[in-house]
């Protein structure tokens, strides 16, 4: 019989003759994988295809962000008959193929995770040679990177009328809760979380008016841990300057 396949994702039309029912193109990826920053993650991806015993050249590709158009983070190519997929691209040298594409496995290991790796990834396989065909996962796998809090900046800045304010910025996932403590603040002061636009893992807390000299401590905490940092305010009394 004749099977005609329209691959809507690639806008290709393939017509093949088969003597028995064949596998269709499909990709199996989990919706989400979680891992901690600094650790490694595995992005599983397996596939089925209609080209039985395909032994020709193939390319395995992983993209980030969006399917079909997102930037490639990994690419390897296997020559006809070869089980070895030779890596041609590994962004920052952190992406490594675990699976064997000849055995329909494109699973990828991502090393030294950072919060910036928290995005969606899409696997793709391309056949060349006698058969020309390709397929890419539509929905991909979301890599959710978690991280204990880290205070990335703490500073004292001048504000109007010779006053001073303190800013503390921390990153983490889940986004950390920030608290200030210091002279005349009591034991601690909870700060309102304000994730910065376009920086989903960054949280900033402001202490608007530092009324006393001394040590001010910012504490960031989430379910994975806590971090703290301090600044010191010392004003030269009788002058308009300050030492921090």
């Amino acid at each position: 019989f004749v099977r005609t396949k329209i691959d809507t994702t690639e806008n290709l039309l393939n017509t093949e003759v088969h003597s028995s029912p064949a596998q269709r193109w499909s990709m199996q990826v989990p919706p989400e994988v979680s891992a901690e920053a600094g650790d490694a993650a595995v992005l599983p991806c397996t596939f089925t295809h209609p080209h039985r015993h395909y032994d020709g050249p193939l390319t395995a590709i992983w993209r980030a962000g969006e399917p079909y158009a997102g930037p490639q983070v990994f690419r390897c190519a296997a020559a006809r008959g070869s089980e070895l997929c030779q890596t041609a691209l590994s962004l920052h040298g952190r992406f490594r193929l675990l699976g064997n594409p000849r055995r329909n496995d494109l699973s990828l290991r991502v090393e030294r995770l950072a919060l910036a790796d928290d995005r969606r990834y899409f696997c793709r396989v391309e056949f060349a040679g006698d058969v020309h065909d390709r397929y890419e996962s539509r929905h991909g796998v979301r890599l959710h990177v978690t991280a204990a809090p880290r205070i990335v900046n703490i500073s004292v800045l001048p504000s109007p009328a010779h006053a001073f304010r303190a800013l503390c910025t921390a990153e983490g996932e889940p986004p950390p809760a920030l608290a200030w403590s210091g002279p005349a603040l009591g034991n601690s002061l909870a700060a309102v979380r304000s994730p910065r636009e376009g920086h989903g893992h960054l949280v900033t807390a402001e202490l608007p008016a530092l009324t006393h000299d001394g040590r001010y401590t910012c504490t960031a905490a989430n379910s994975l841990g806590r971090s703290e940092a301090s600044v010191y305010l010392f004003r030269f009394h009788g002058a308009s300057g300050a030492s921090t």
């Epitope: 891992a35 993650a41 595995v42 030779q86 590994s90 490594r96």
Partner: antibody, heavy 121, light 111 residues
């Protein structure tokens, strides 16, 4: 046929230096990571160092206790990997094996016969 | 560092009988279903040889009487029918986290 041949072992005094070489053939050297694994006499195996390939920026990794004293390097034109060992101690006495690993897996699919390093006064 | 503990330290098995070696990791070495444990065989005076990679995959040229299983922290190497040529020391190794570490080894002998 894959071949991995170590050389450069021998007797050295404590505090001395030695450079081990590992010549390979029978495979495309550029496609693989290379490692050194050692085995003290009558003891178990201990991974020493890894050097990755060009795609992986020739990144190097070391056992923490050895970092700073040992340096792994590779010469792709000669399909050879090296281990420079400085400030040698008695506890570095071992057979040193050169091993190959795939870019996707840190397991060692081919091993050389090893070269014996003896650190003694 | 991840510590691998093999048991038993030595094992005597009759020819044709099953030999089982265990390897326990101090923390999980499995990520998303992939287990980063590998097994090697070392005969006296020879370098080690890869038997099993990623817990259960038979290396090229290794007889089917060798098999591996396990997940998380507990792994097993099984020789289904011990042959005279299987007398050796067997090591597990993890590549979940650097530094890569080995178990202390299990010596297999004929009973």
């Amino acid at each position: 046929e894959v071949q991995v041949v170590e050389s450069g072992g021998g007797l050295v005094q404590p505090g001395g230096s030695l450079r081990l070489s590992c010549a390979t053939s029978g495979f495309n050297f550029n496609d693989y990571f290379m490692n050194w694994v050692r085995q003290a006499p009558g003891k178990g195996l201990e991974w020493v160092a890894q050097i990755r390939n060009k795609i992986y920026t020739y990144a190097t990794f070391y056992a923490e206790s050895l970092e700073g004293r040992f340096t792994i390097s590779r010469d792709n034109s000669k399909s050879t990997v090296y281990l420079q060992m400085n400030s040698l101690r008695a506890e570095d006495t071992a057979v040193y094996y050169c091993t190959r690993s795939l870019t996707g897996g840190d397991y060692f699919d081919y091993w050389g016969q090893g070269t014996l390093v003896t650190v003694s006064s | 560092d991840i510590v691998l503990t093999q048991s038993p330290d030595s094992l005597a098995v009759s020819l044709g009988e099953r030999a089982t070696i265990n390897c326990r990791a101090s923390q999980s070495v499995t990520i998303s279903g992939y287990s980063f444990i590998h097994w090697y065989q070392q005969k006296p005076g020879q370098p080690p040889k890869l038997l099993i990679y990623r817990a259960s995959n038979l290396a090229s040229g290794i007889p089917a009487r060798f098999s591996g299983s396990g997940s998380g922290t507990d792994f097993t190497l099984t020789i289904s029918s011990l042959q005279a040529e299987d007398v050796a020391t067997y090591y597990c190794q993890q590549s979940r986290k650097s530094p890569w570490t080995f178990g202390q080894g299990t010596k297999v002998e004929i009973k």
